[in-house]
């Protein structure tokens, strides 16, 4: 029954984490006008992976999509890759996870077949988590570098006479939701893990077979193996999945300060 | 047809509060924002401040401490309350629809306000 | 606040003629998001509120008779009327439409002989 829950709130955790990554990607506010300490405009800008938006305080706003390719930035493209693949490998853990499930039966599916699909999906569900993590991440890295490069030269004098202003960008909604969706999979997947350990078939155990040998009569037997989990004893891998649970937990780590303007 | 009529007490005295009130139709308040601005006689234009489709407001710094904008959505109606008047309050007080680029696409005929004892 | 300068504060042509009124603003009024400026124009005729020509620096809003144009980037911009008619008698006003408080210029009057 544990087991069945575990499996069923994996999924369902890694579903909204999968979701969330989605709507990121999809969002365009990756990145917004920072208003602090910036004089005040009645335009306010925000871009996203795929186009940039300026919204006007009368209510208009104009999206242009980046029609170019070549023309962006390398960077802005390792994060588009990286969500998109974080989103393909998302969905086809999704599809796998379906299958997989203690509840829906379908013909005659051994426990191992459902044992395997679960941990793939789970695997897959951790490596879409950290790419949606990573993608967002560097593309936070790029906001910081580029917002203190342009407070260091916020004002650009033309012979003392004109100024000019340049726009400051800091983070955007985003790329919180990407953080926290990233989380969500992530754990969705180490959830799927652990249910796989419990989906595994129990130990089968052999008739001892008896083996004489001039004189000496020596048992042997063999001890029972998880199939294709590669794992040892059910009890020890417990422990090493509770305290991976732990370590999860911990180590998902939130932004402190929400920069929204 | 879109159309603004600013409507005001026409005279004020000295140190007395001002309540124009701008009744718009052939647009909704929930889609644009409207702007005040005046015009002294013989002068120039200036900007007063303005409210938003959300409800939001910008004012004049200069003005701020004695401006106030408000709206009523479901009566199409925009109202400026400014303080404190003196006589170089005397103008002609506008209000704008905003369109696009945050400009003044519809202005009302205006409402002469006269600062006096 | 931002200070619009515009030149010369008054002009007068005979029609026909082309006229070109300048406008000049303290800061940039171009928005790196969208590379528009955002200045406009307005006329004022004698005894009417004043009336929207040009957004955008060089979008002339629907009506306006194609000879008002709009041009000009950054910091400089121009208003030109390529064939001055009677009717143009009027004030010209430019304002900043990017930065808090929207400020106007002080106008250019346009009067014909």
């Known amino acids: 029954m544990a087991v069945t829950a575990c499996q069923g709130l994996g999924f369902v955790v890694s579903l909204i984490g999968i979701a969330g990554i989605i709507a990121a990607t999809c969002m365009d506010q990756w990145s917004t006008q920072d208003l602090y300490n910036n004089p005040v405009t009645a335009v306010f800008n925000y871009q996203g992976l795929w186009r940039s938006c300026v919204r006007e305080s009368s209510g208009f706003t104009e999206c242009r999509g980046y029609f170019t390719l070549l023309g962006l930035p390398a960077m802005l493209q390792a994060v588009r890759a990286l969500m998109i693949v974080g989103i393909v490998l998302g969905a086809i853990g999704l599809l796998v996870s379906i299958f997989a499930l203690k509840c829906i039966r379908i013909g005659s599916m051994e426990d191992s077949a459902k044992a395997n699909m679960t941990l793939t999906s789970g695997i897959m569900f951790i490596v879409s988590g950290l790419c949606a993590i990573a993608g967002v991440s560097v593309f936070a890295n790029m906001l910081v570098t580029n917002f203190w490069m342009s407070t260091a030269n916020m004002y650009t004098g033309m012979g003392g006479m004109v100024q000019t202003v340049q726009t400051r960008y800091t983070f955007g909604a985003a790329l919180f939701v990407g953080w926290v969706a990233g989380g969500l999979t992530l754990i969705g997947g180490v959830m799927m893990c652990i249910a796989c350990r419990g989906l595994a078939p129990e130990e089968t155990n052999y008739k001892a077979v008896s083996y004489h040998a001039s004189g000496h009569s020596v048992a042997y037997k063999p001890g029972g193996f998880k199939a294709s989990t590669g794992f040892g004893s059910n009890t020890k891998n417990k422990k090493i999945y509770d305290g991976g649970a732990r370590t999860e937990d911990e180590v998902q780590s939130y932004p402190s300060k929400h920069d929204y303007v | 047809e879109v159309q603004l009529k600013e409507s005001g007490p026409g005279l004020v005295a000295p140190s007395q509060s001002l309540s124009i009130t701008c009744t718009v139709s052939g647009f909704s308040l929930t889609n644009y924002g409207v702007s005040w601005i005046r015009q002294p006689p013989g002068k120039g234009l200036e900007w007063l401040g303005a409210i938003w489709a959300g409800g939001n407001t910008n004012y004049n710094s200069a003005l701020m401490s004695r401006l106030s904008i408000r709206k009523d959505n479901s009566k199409s109606q925009v109202f400026l309350k400014m303080n404190s008047l003196q006589t170089d309050d005397t103008a002609m007080y506008y209000c704008?629809?905003?369109?696009?680029?945050?400009?003044?696409?519809?202005w009302g005929q205006g409402t002469l306000v006269t600062v006096s004892a | 606040d931002i200070v619009m300068t515009q030149s010369p504060s008054s002009l007068t042509v005979t029609a026909g003629e082309k006229v070109t009124l300048s406008c000049k603003s303290s800061q940039t009024l171009l928005n790196s998001g969208n590379q528009k400026n955002y200045l406009t124009w307005y006329q004022q005729k004698p005894g009417q509120p004043p009336k929207l020509l040009i957004y955008w620096a060089s979008t002339r809003e629907s009506g306006v008779p194609d000879r008002f144009t709009g041009s000009g980037s950054g910091t400089d911009f121009t208003l030109t009327i390529s064939s001055v008619q009677a009717e143009d008698l009027a004030v010209y006003y430019c304002?900043?439409?990017?930065?808090?408080?929207?400020?106007f210029g002080a106008g250019t009057r346009l009067e014909i002989k």
């Open positions: 704008a629809r905003v369109g696009y680029g945050n400009s003044f696409a519809n």
């Open positions: 304002q900043n439409n990017y930065f808090y408080p929207l400020t």
